[in-house]
Amino acid sequence: DVERTTCPPEKEVHEIDESLIFYKKRELEACVDAALLAAQMDRVDAIPFTYEQLDVLKHKLDELYPQGYPESVIRHLGHLFLKMSPEDIRKWNVTSLETLKALLKVSKGHEMSAQVATLIDRVVVGRGQLDKDTVDTLTAFCPGCLCSLSPERLSSVPPSVIGAVRPQDLDTCGPRQLDVLYPKARLAFQNMSGSEYFVKIRPFLGGAPTEDVKALSQQNVSMDLATFMKLRREAVLPLTVAEVQKLLGPHVEGLKVEEQHSPVRDWILKQRQDDLDTLGLGLQGGIPNGYLILDLSVREALS
């Protein structure tokens, strides 16, 4: 923590300018008025402060705004944003996309994924929902950041906005996030023709239920292996060998390469070996001929 001293008269600060780079940490602490700093934040980023000096400026702002900075200050943080922790950012109320853009630009090239995720979260809360303008900003300035949002935040995305999401924006999304996004995509794209629909829905299919995957198998979509491997294990397990063959089309040969990886491995274990043999791929591990399969989950549900 910076020790308190009184400011020498000749060092009194009346405006934020380049002369401050020659101030020692304790001089900055003693001589810079926090209210003046806040009022002239737009000048700070143009001044080549050291990281130590930025620490002092942050400390001044923290004292002035213990409940969180106002957006007029946040908008002009510039490189001072690099000093912010997720805990700091959680106190903010951000509604302007210009503020978001400015801070996303500053964070580029720095290890700030937690801070950026928290910032985006605050923007979504501040704006009330994840609207099209916010999604457009994220996809333009922070590819992959959409997936930093919690499923609860993603639930505020209107289906009409889903069309603005690109496949690469979903690369880092986990199953719980895709569970939220997939039904929105399904609603958003439902008026498209079969082939166009599949192209659009494909990046979201990690959130699809079995019945939707089965329906796709009837539509000659020739799903690629990468998409198949991202399907939920629970969505894949009930598929028959015939359904998987129809779903993958010419890509069915890729099952051999993925034989030891989930969900393919788990799916193989649930198929009759005779059925797997019809694929001619040499897949092993299926249920031997003559064995009886009991589906206990359905029996329990009936009891």
Epitope: S155, V180, L187, P209, T210, D212, L216, R232, S297, L302
Partner: antibody
Framework: QVQLQESGPGLVKPSETLSLTCTVS????????WSWVRQPPGKGLEWIGY???????NSNPSLKSRVIISVDTSKNQFSLKLSSVTAADTAVYYC????????????????WGRGTLVTVSS | EIVMTQSPATLSVSPGERATLSCRAS??????LAWYQQKPGQAPRLLIY???TRATGIPARFSGSGSGTEFTLTISSLQSEDFAVYYC?????????FGQGTRLEIK
């Protein structure tokens, strides 16, 4: 043959929480989206919300602040909790299956429970 | 939210005759419309989806038409079991919304 059965108390006091459960028998809860729909006596239908087996939900904005929909895959059940009820929440509550086929890509219901009447009264 | 309006509220038709029920959406729902039949004390039953596709097991006398904001359910030759309440439902956007229903009664 998949069947749905609603269960829960038929009488709830004002300001309390209405709790209902829908049991899915004859098939797995994992394969579809599952909804709650209600119908006040002599009136039309109102969609309350849906749940996916993973726990992902979506509900009607008019009820969102009072609605919790949850799922228990081990029991093949999903549940509805509606808090701070008033007489206006008196209705027959149905659980229903969303048809879930991309071939017809829609959010409509091909299978319904028989419904259970919940009366809100002191 | 999309408001669905059905007309008439009650329709009186003789058995064997044709019944035409209307449903209007407050904004376009494309062809994302379903029709249900509900009899007293029973749950609704899906008749039509996609505005015009009959659900499994629904007799050919039931037909749906329309797109955008105007939709029609037609029952070509009324049977005694067809007298019930009919609801339309849009699924073009959330929240899913239903019409207030048309009661089809025997004349």
């Amino acid at each position: 043959q998949v069947q749905l059965q609603e269960s829960g108390p038929g009488l709830v006091k004002p300001s309390e929480t209405l709790s209902l459960t829908c049991t899915v028998s004859g098939g797995s809860i994992n394969n579809y989206y599952w909804s709650w729909v209600r119908q006040p006596p002599g009136k039309g239908l109102e969609w309350i919300g849906y749940i996916f087996y993973s726990g992902s939900t979506n509900s009607n904005p008019s009820l969102k602040s009072r609605v919790i929909i949850s799922v228990d895959t081990s029991k093949n059940q999903f549940s509805l909790k509606l808090s701070s009820v008033t007489a206006a929440d008196t209705a027959v509550y149905y659980c229903a299956r969303e048809v879930g086929r991309i071939a017809v890509a829609g959010w409509f219901f091909d299978l319904w429970g028989r419904g259970t009447l919940v009366t809100v009264s002191s | 939210e999309i408001v669905m309006t059905q007309s008439p509220a009650t329709l009186s038709v003789s058995p064997g005759e044709r019944a035409t029920l209307s449903c209007r959406a407050s904004q376009s729902v494309n062809s994302n419309l379903a029709w249900y039949q509900q009899k007293p004390g029973q749950a609704p039953r899906l008749l039509i989806y996609g505005a015009s596709t009959r659900a499994t097991g629904i007799p050919a006398r039931f037909s749906g038409s329309g797109s955008g904001t105007e939709f029609t359910l037609t029952i070509s030759s009324l049977q005694s079991e067809d007298f019930a309440v009919y609801y339309c439902q849009q699924y073009n956007n959330w929240p899913l919304t239903f019409g207030q229903g048309t009661r089809l009664e025997i004349k």
